[in-house]
């Protein structure tokens, strides 16, 4: 069974551009989480969804960040406009 699938694996963009990250959770999982990890700030929970509904987005108070989960098998995290300090590893995770 395939695990959580994210795309793209790598993204390089110019400051001010829009970035969209995509995630396909494990089939049957009803919770989805977006995290950000940097050396300076560690691992931060940005937002999580339960049954496609955003439950807590307090990890992304900047309105440059937005996340959607239109159906049980797909979610996006968008940054618009992007800033150099957004450089990080972004993780998507899912759970039952």
């Amino acid at each position: 069974d395939a695990g959580v699938i994210q795309s793209p694996r790598h993204e390089v963009t110019e400051m001010g551009q829009e970035v969209t990250l995509r995630c396909k959770p494990i089939s049957g999982h009803n919770s989805l989480f977006w995290y950000r990890q940097t050396m300076m700030r560690g691992l931060e929970l940005l937002i999580y969804f339960n049954n496609n509904v955003p439950i807590d987005d307090s990890g992304m108070p900047e309105d440059r960040f937005s996340a959607k989960m239109p159906n049980a098998s797909f979610s996006t995290l968008k940054i618009q406009p992007s800033e150099p300090r957004d450089s990080a590893v972004y993780f998507c995770a899912s759970s039952l």
Partner: antibody
């Protein structure tokens, strides 16, 4: 009914410390981001700090980094602001506010901090 | 930091007047948020995401704008509207406020 009640303000000497508290009720505190905002006498609003529900995401105003520390205890429904090395220019009313509608949708009544010798 | 500049800083108007307050950002923002504050009281959220009225806010208040310039309009001033108004941005931390616009009775 959402309620935010600040406490811990008072008179402190320059260089001193103070810890402000904000007791929250009427909503699920453990799911909400929280802000501190201050207002010096006769001046405008100044954003101080933000903390996410689980404390993993924290932001500070650039000028306050290193002196002020935001924290929360979700088991006590309480938000804190630890203020060290206080200066006269930190004299202000300090408000806690709940993050909602992408902004600050509920505010406390404020607690007054006076830094003076 | 993104600096927000409100104009005018002071505004004298009469009951029934239509008034507009402008908030200009030094860098483009996605949305602007507006608050009302009366003397000795905490601020109150008026408008979020540029144009959405917070619960309980009368429909005479409206917001608009994009990019670097946003406006708050009160279509017909009521006695209870005389207060100080602040804009704020959440596009990028630090979450700066405008310096405020004090609306006084003429």
């Amino acid at each position: 009914e959402v309620q935010l009640v600040e406490s811990g303000g008072g008179l402190v000497q320059p260089g001193g410390s103070l810890r402000l508290s904000c007791a929250a009720s009427g909503f699920t505190f453990s799911n909400q981001g929280m802000h501190w905002v201050r207002q010096a006498p006769g001046k405008g609003l100044e954003w101080v700090s933000y903390i996410s529900s689980g404390s993993s995401t924290i932001y500070y105003a650039d000028t306050l980094k290193g002196r002020f520390t935001i924290s929360r205890d979700n088991s006590k429904n309480t938000l804190y602001l630890q203020m060290n090395s206080l200066r006269a220019e930190d004299t202000a009313v300090y408000y806690c506010a709940r993050r909602g509608e992408g902004a600050m949708d509920y505010w406390g009544q404020g607690t007054t901090v006076t830094v003076s010798s | 930091d993104n600096q927000l500049t409100q104009s005018p800083s002071f505004l004298s108007a009469s009951v029934g007047d239509r008034v507009t307050i402008t908030c200009r950002a030094s860098s483009s923002v996605n949305y602007i948020y507006w608050y009302q504050q009366k003397p000795g009281k905490a601020p109150k959220l008026l408008i979020y995401y540029t144009s959405n009225l917070a619960p309980g806010v009368p429909s005479r208040f409206s917001g608009s704008g994009s990019g670097n310039e946003y406006t708050l309009t009160i279509s017909s001033l009521q006695p209870e509207d005389f207060a100080t108004y602040y804009c704020q941005q959440f596009t990028s931390s630090p979450f700066t406020f405008g310096q405020g616009t004090k609306l006084e009775i003429k």
